[in-house]
C-alpha cells in the first residue's frame, strides 16, 4: 500500500534511454502519443514530473522503521496526464485522470546509480517500462541479473 497520499518529493526531469534517445510526448487527436527518438542538437527535451511516494512492501520485516519500504513513482509529462501500464497490451500509455491515481500509474523505482533508473509496474512485478521498436512498452524481466538490460534503463536529467 502507498504509505501517504502526498508525494514525499517531486522532481522535474527529462527522460532519455540508456542510449541517449529522448522520450517525447505529442498531442495527436486529443490524446498524447509517446515517442523514443533522437533529438536535433538544440531541440528542447520534454520534461516529466516524477512524484515519489513511499510504499510499504507486504512483508514481516521490522526494525529501523524503513524496512520493506520502496519508492514508487508516477510520471506526468503534462497536467492531468500520467503514464499508465497497460498490462494486457504490454504497452505504456498516457491517460488523463484525477487523483487518487490508479495502481497502473505507479512504478517501483530501481536504480543502477543516481541518474540511471528502471520503472517496475506496481500491478505486475517483474515487468518494467522498456524500449521496443522506438516506443515504450512493458518488458518482462526474468531475473535480477537482467535489470541491467539496456532497454529498461533510463536516464534522468535536469537539462
Amino acid at each position: 500500500s502507498i504509505t501517504g497520499i502526498s508525494p514525499i518529493t517531486e522532481y522535474l526531469a527529462s527522460l532519455s534511454t540508456y542510449n541517449d534517445q529522448s522520450i517525447t510526448f505529442a498531442l495527436e487527436d486529443e490524446s498524447y502519443e509517446i515517442y523514443v527518438e533522437d533529438l536535433k542538437k538544440d531541440e528542447k527535451k520534454d520534461k516529466v514530473l516524477l512524484s515519489y511516494y513511499e510504499s510499504q512492501h507486504p512483508s514481516n520485516e521490522s526494525g529501523d522503521g524503513v524496512d520493506g519500504k520502496m519508492l514508487m513513482v508516477t510520471l506526468s509529462p503534462t497536467k492531468d496526464f500520467w503514464l499508465h501500464a497497460n498490462n494486457k497490451e504490454h504497452s505504456v500509455e498516457l491517460h488523463k485522470c484525477e487523483k487518487p491515481l490508479p495502481d497502473q500509474a505507479f512504478f517501483v523505482l530501481h536504480n543502477m546509480h543516481s541518474n540511471c533508473v528502471s520503472f517496475e509496474c506496481k500491478t505486475d512485478p517483474g515487468v518494467f517500462i522498456g524500449v521496443k521498436d522506438n516506443h515504450l512498452a512493458l518488458i518482462k524481466v526474468d531475473s535480477s541479473e537482467n535489470l541491467c538490460t539496456e532497454n529498461i534503463l533510463f536516464k534522468l536529467s535536469e537539462t
Epitope: E54, E61, S62, K69, L109, H110, S114, N115, S144, E158
Partner: antibody, heavy 121, light 106 residues
Framework: EVQLVETGGGLVQPGRSLKLSCVAS????????MYWIRQAPGMGLEWVSS????????YYLDSVKGRFTISRNNAENTVYLQMNSLRSEDTATYYC??????????????WGQGTLVTVSS | DIQMTQSPSVLSASVGDRVTLSCKAS??????LDWYQQKVGEAPKLLIY???NLQTGIPSRFSGSGSGTDYTLTISSLQPEDVATYFC????????FGQGTKVEIK
C-alpha cells in the same frame, strides 16, 4: 531488529591488505544497496563505496579506486571491503550502512557501529 | 563532482533556542539531500531524508527545507540531547557529505 556488525579492522602496515566484513540481519538483505563510509579520527564522514542489491554495480571514491573492492554474498547476508595497498590516509573507522529503500541508492537507512582500521608502520 | 559546504562549523546555542544549520551544494541536487546526526562515540543516524522527510522515531523539533543548491536543518527548540555533529549528504549525483556542523550548548 536490524543489525549490521562490522569486523576485520586492526593495525596494518602501509602497503599491506585488510578485508572488512559486515554481517547483516533483521531485513531482506538482497533487496538493499549496501555501502562503506569512513571517518578519520576527529574528522568528518567520507563515502567510500557502494554496491547495488544484486552486486552487479559497484562504485568507489576516486582515491580508493583500483585499491579497494566491494562485494557481497546475498546467501550469507554479508558485504565485504577488500582493501589493498593501504596508505596512512586510509586510517579511519569504517562503517557499513544499508540503503533506506528497496532497490535504490538513496540514503543510508541504518549504520553499523564501525570497525577501526589503523595504517601505520 | 558535487561539493557540499556546511555552515557554521560550530554552533553554540542555549537550551530552547531555535537553531538553523545550512548546507550549500555546488550544483542543483533536486532535493536529493539527507541530514545525519552523530553523537560522540556513536555511529551516525539518519534524521531527515529527501530534504524534508522526518525519519521514523526522530522528534518533530527537527525539520528540513530547501531546494536547488540551498538546504537547511532546523531544530525548533534545542535540547541537551541534541548536542552532536550534523552532516548533510547529497545523492543526486554520486554520494557526498558536507564537512559537518558541531552543535554545542552554551
Amino acid at each position: 531488529e536490524v543489525q549490521l556488525v562490522e569486523t576485520g579492522g586492526g593495525l596494518v602496515q602501509p602497503g599491506r591488505s585488510l578485508k572488512l566484513s559486515c554481517v547483516a540481519s533483521g531485513f531482506t538483505f538482497s533487496n538493499y544497496w549496501m555501502y562503506w563510509i569512513r571517518q578519520a579520527p576527529g574528522m568528518g564522514l567520507e563515502w567510500v563505496s557502494s554496491i547495488n542489491n544484486d552486486g552487479g554495480n559497484t562504485y568507489y571514491l576516486d582515491s580508493v579506486k583500483g585499491r579497494f573492492t566491494i562485494s557481497r554474498n546475498n546467501a550469507e547476508n554479508t558485504v565485504y571491503l577488500q582493501m589493498n595497498s593501504l596508505r596512512s590516509e586510509d586510517t579511519a573507522t569504517y562503517y557499513c550502512a544499508k540503503g533506506h529503500y528497496y532497490y535504490t541508492s538513496y540514503s543510508f537507512g541504518y549504520w553499523g557501529q564501525g570497525t577501526l582500521v589503523t595504517v601505520s608502520s | 563532482d558535487i561539493q557540499m559546504t556546511q555552515s557554521p562549523s560550530v554552533l553554540s546555542a542555549s537550551v530552547g533556542d531555535r537553531v538553523t544549520l545550512s548546507c550549500k551544494a555546488s550544483h542543483n541536487i533536486n532535493k536529493h539531500l539527507d541530514w545525519y546526526q552523530q553523537k560522540v562515540g556513536e555511529a551516525p543516524k539518519l534524521l531527515i531524508y529527501f530534504t524534508n522527510n522526518l525519519q521514523t522515531g526522530i522528534p518533530s523539533r527537527f525539520s528540513g527545507s530547501g531546494s536547488g543548491t540551498d538546504y537547511t536543518l532546523t531544530i525548533s527548540s534545542l535540547q541537551p540531547e541534541d548536542v552532536a555533529t550534523y552532516f548533510c549528504f547529497q545523492y543526486n549525483s554520486g554520494w557526498t557529505f558536507g564537512q559537518g556542523t558541531k552543535v554545542e550548548i552554551k
